[in-house]
């Protein structure tokens, strides 16, 4: 059977006026997954995102990540979109005073 990912969105200061938002998916099986940032509901182009490899995490499951740089104050327009085994979920960027959003998608 399939094991749904745990999805975690974090933010970090990148440069003046910019932040990097990172979306990590972990503990999922099988390894096929879609992880991408969306702005105003639409997927960002490939060249504005950085992806990590899908790697085994040592428990027979996998992990990966995607990151993008955005303007500070625009965070709410962005969501991490995850698709795995026919299910999807969306994960917003937390406000500045909180850094984590964990969610099993099904």
């Amino acid at each position: 059977g399939s094991v749904p990912p745990m999805v975690n969105v974090t933010r970090s200061e990148a440069s003046e006026g910019n932040i990097t938002v990172t979306c990590r998916a972990s503990s999922f099986y099988p390894r096929n997954i879609t992880l991408t940032w969306r702005q105003d509901g639409v997927s960002l182009s490939h060249d504005t995102q950085q992806w990590g490899d899908v790697l085994p995490d040592g428990n027979g499951t996998y992990q990966t990540w995607v990151a993008t740089r955005i303007c500070q104050g625009e965070e709410q327009r962005f969501t991490c979109y995850m698709e795995h085994s026919g299910n999807h979920s969306t994960h917003p960027v937390p406000s500045g005073n909180s850094h984590h959003h964990h969610h099993h998608h099904h």
Epitope: Q76, N87, H88, S89, T90, P92, S95, H101, H103
Partner: antibody
Framework: EVQLVQSGAEVKKPGSSVKVSCKAS????????IEWVRQAPGQGLEWIGA????????NYNEKFKDRATLTADKSTNTAYMELSSLRSEDTAVYFC??????????WGQGTLVTVSS | DIQMTQSPSSLSASVGDRVTITCRAS??????LAWYQQKPGKSPKLLVY???TLADGVPSRFSGSGSGTDYTLTISSLQPEDFATYFC?????????FGQGTKVEIK
């Protein structure tokens, strides 16, 4: 102009199924998630689930996971919500809506489903 | 699931009145909150998103505020067309949940 046009009212028997359609126009259908919400008479709103029309991937409210099926037809820009094993408590207006990032910006006009023996 | 508690459930007001509706979430929703207006027999109409951003075409007498768990919709000077039911909705996590609604009636 973005428009979501839903199918007409339905009257169904308990135990049967209903399939409501939502035809999108005025935007790229496969780019945005379609959400489904219902509203029982005189009641609040309840989220049923969502579908990515591009891939067919779904996200269901646990409450509806066993009875609701969301599908989409890219060739006709139409999303569907099927609800099975209907009971009287399912009498409600069913809405589709477009998910614009982190809110619903456009809604269908609603489809009244009445479940009655 | 995040519960959304909206108050009051109904209120009576006159044209020109200032009206305030509140919504409290059972957990931090990070300002991922929308407000909708609904009239009988119609679908909800988006008024405010991200807690305080006014949707296109919405009159400036409407405003939203709040953060964390507590949010407010204010109508600065009630107009005849504002008599309707108002709902809040959180978008922080699924299942997306709504407040039970506030019916604004003519006094």
């Amino acid at each position: 102009e973005v428009q979501l046009v839903q199918s007409g009212a339905e009257v169904k028997k308990p135990g049967s199924s209903v399939k409501v359609s939502c035809k999108a126009s005025g935007y790229a259908f496969t780019n945005y998630l379609i959400e489904w919400v219902r509203q029982a008479p005189g009641q609040g709103l309840e989220w049923i689930g969502a579908i990515n029309p591009g891939s067919g991937a779904t996200n269901y409210n646990e409450k509806f996971k066993d009875r609701a099926t969301l599908t989409a037809d890219k060739s006709t820009n139409t999303a569907y919500m099927e609800l099975s094993s209907l009971r009287s408590e399912d009498t409600a207006v069913y809405f589709c809506a477009r998910f614009l990032g982190n809110y619903f910006d456009n809604w269908g006009q609603g489809t009244l489903v009445t479940v009655s023996s | 699931d995040i519960q959304m508690t909206q108050s009051p459930s109904s209120l009576s007001a006159s044209v020109g009145d200032r009206v305030t509706i509140t919504c409290r979430a059972s957990g931090n929703i990070h300002s991922y909150l929308a407000w909708y207006q609904q009239k009988p027999g119609k679908s909800p109409k988006l008024l405010v998103y991200y807690a305080e951003t006014l949707a296109d075409g919405v009159p400036s007498r409407f405003s939203g505020s709040g953060s964390g768990t507590d949010y407010t919709l204010t109508i600065s000077s009630l107009q005849p067309e504002d008599f309707a039911t108002y709902f809040c909705q959180q978008f922080w996590t699924t299942p997306y949940t709504f407040g039970q609604g506030t019916k604004v009636e003519i006094k």
